[in-house]
């Protein structure tokens, strides 16, 4: 079972890959961004629940196309290249979702603009972060 | 057949605590996040806490620091240490479990929690 | 905490009668929504999950549908097992929110 220091750690780590989240959010709906209409064209695949740690195998599998649509945003909008925002938040990933390789993401039947999957996303940080006990 | 039997309801004094627990049966118990819902007499239904596959625990605000989660993958079973207990925590106790994608599929019979003087 | 307002709060059918309950959400749920029957003294029932989709077992005449804030649960022909409570659900995120219940009487 988790320990406190691990509970801690996961709570650190949370709060870190939401700010990241929403550090890309804030990017992308800047005013000044010019490419923001032609992103909202992409779609992404939102997680059908998504409320355990387990669950961030759905925010992996999305990570690839989110680097290539945050390539053509102007990279003034972010304080690191999307390639480095974007591996920075695997590390992350990676680590709070464990290494239970066989547990296999299922996708809602809708898809999602990158703003609402960012949404999603910061969502389940902040509620994970208020109700990790 | 998925069975889960909830037990360890009763009669206790506010300030008091009670240890409720759930023996399941019928599935692979480890692979599963069970919760515990609660419903006060007359009223709807409330989430109160989770305890998922890797043992780590989610509840509300209402019972945060006196309610525990916990579970004995050994034993099929799943627990809820309830301490400071108040009036407003009177209910029938339901053990239900979450399916990985989707919502609680299974529930128990309910266990009766009295917090009365 | 998503609040989820369930609609009405009760209601009074006949058998045979079409019946619909309605849960509206405070923020977009796509589709993490079941729905839950509960007679008096018993645990509830899971009836539909995924906003649409039925359980094992659970009879035809009950559907579900919506996406995003409103969801509807339809009994098509009322019969007299389903005179019950039924809640509807989130589960898009912690904590899990439930609407106030609909309790379906006899006319």
């Known amino acids: 079972a988790p320990t406190s220091s691990s509970t801690k750690k996961t709570q650190l780590q949370l709060e870190h890959l939401l700010l990241d989240l929403q550090m890309i959010l804030n990017g992308i709906n800047n005013y000044k961004n010019p490419k923001l209409t032609r992103m909202l064209t992409f779609k992404f695949y939102m997680p059908k629940k998504a409320t355990e740690l387990k669950h961030l195998q759905c925010l992996e599998e999305e990570l690839k196309p989110l680097e290539e649509v945050l390539n053509l945003a102007q990279s003034k909008n972010f304080h690191l290249r999307p390639r480095d925002l974007i591996s920075n938040i695997n590390v992350i990933v990676l680590e709070l979702k464990g290494s239970e390789t066989t547990f296999m993401c299922e996708y809602a039947d809708e898809t999602a603009t990158i703003v609402e999957f960012l949404n999603r996303w910061i969502t389940f940080c902040q509620s994970i972060i208020s109700t990790l006990t | 057949e998925v069975q889960l039997v909830e037990s360890g309801g009763g009669l206790v004094q506010p300030g008091g605590s009670l240890r409720l627990s759930c023996a399941a049966s019928?599935?692979?118990?480890?692979?599963?996040?069970l919760a515990w819902v609660r419903q006060a007499p007359g009223k709807g239904l409330e989430w109160v806490a989770a305890?998922?596959?890797?043992?780590?625990?989610y509840s509300p605000d209402t019972v945060r620091g006196r309610f525990t989660i916990s579970r004995d993958n050994a034993k099929n079973s799943l627990y809820l240490q309830m301490n400071s207990l108040r009036a407003e925590d009177t209910a029938v106790y339901y053990c239900?479990?979450?399916?990985?994608?989707?919502?609680?599929?299974?529930w128990g019979q309910g266990t009766t929690v009295t917090v009365s003087s | 905490d998503i609040q989820m307002t369930q609609s009405p709060s009760s209601l009074s059918a006949s058998v045979g009668d079409r019946v619909t309950i309605t849960c509206k959400a405070r923020?977009?749920?796509?589709?993490?929504v079941a729905w839950y029957q509960q007679k008096p003294g018993k645990a509830p029932k899971s009836l539909i999950y995924?906003?649409?989709f039925r359980y094992s077992g659970v009879p035809s005449r009950f559907s579900g549908s919506g996406s995003g804030t409103d969801f509807t649960l339809t009994i098509s022909s009322l019969q007299p097992e389903d005179f019950a409570t039924y809640y509807c659900?989130?589960?898009?995120?912690?904590?899990?929110?439930f609407g106030g219940g609909t309790k379906v009487e006899i006319k």
């Open positions: 239900a479990r979450d399916s990985n994608w989707d919502a609680l599929d299974y």
């Open positions: 019928g599935f692979t118990f480890s692979s599963y996040t």
């Open positions: 305890i998922d596959s890797s043992s780590y625990t």
């Open positions: 923020e977009k749920l796509w589709s993490a």
């Open positions: 995924s906003a649409s």
């Open positions: 659900q989130q589960y898009y995120t912690y904590p899990y929110t």
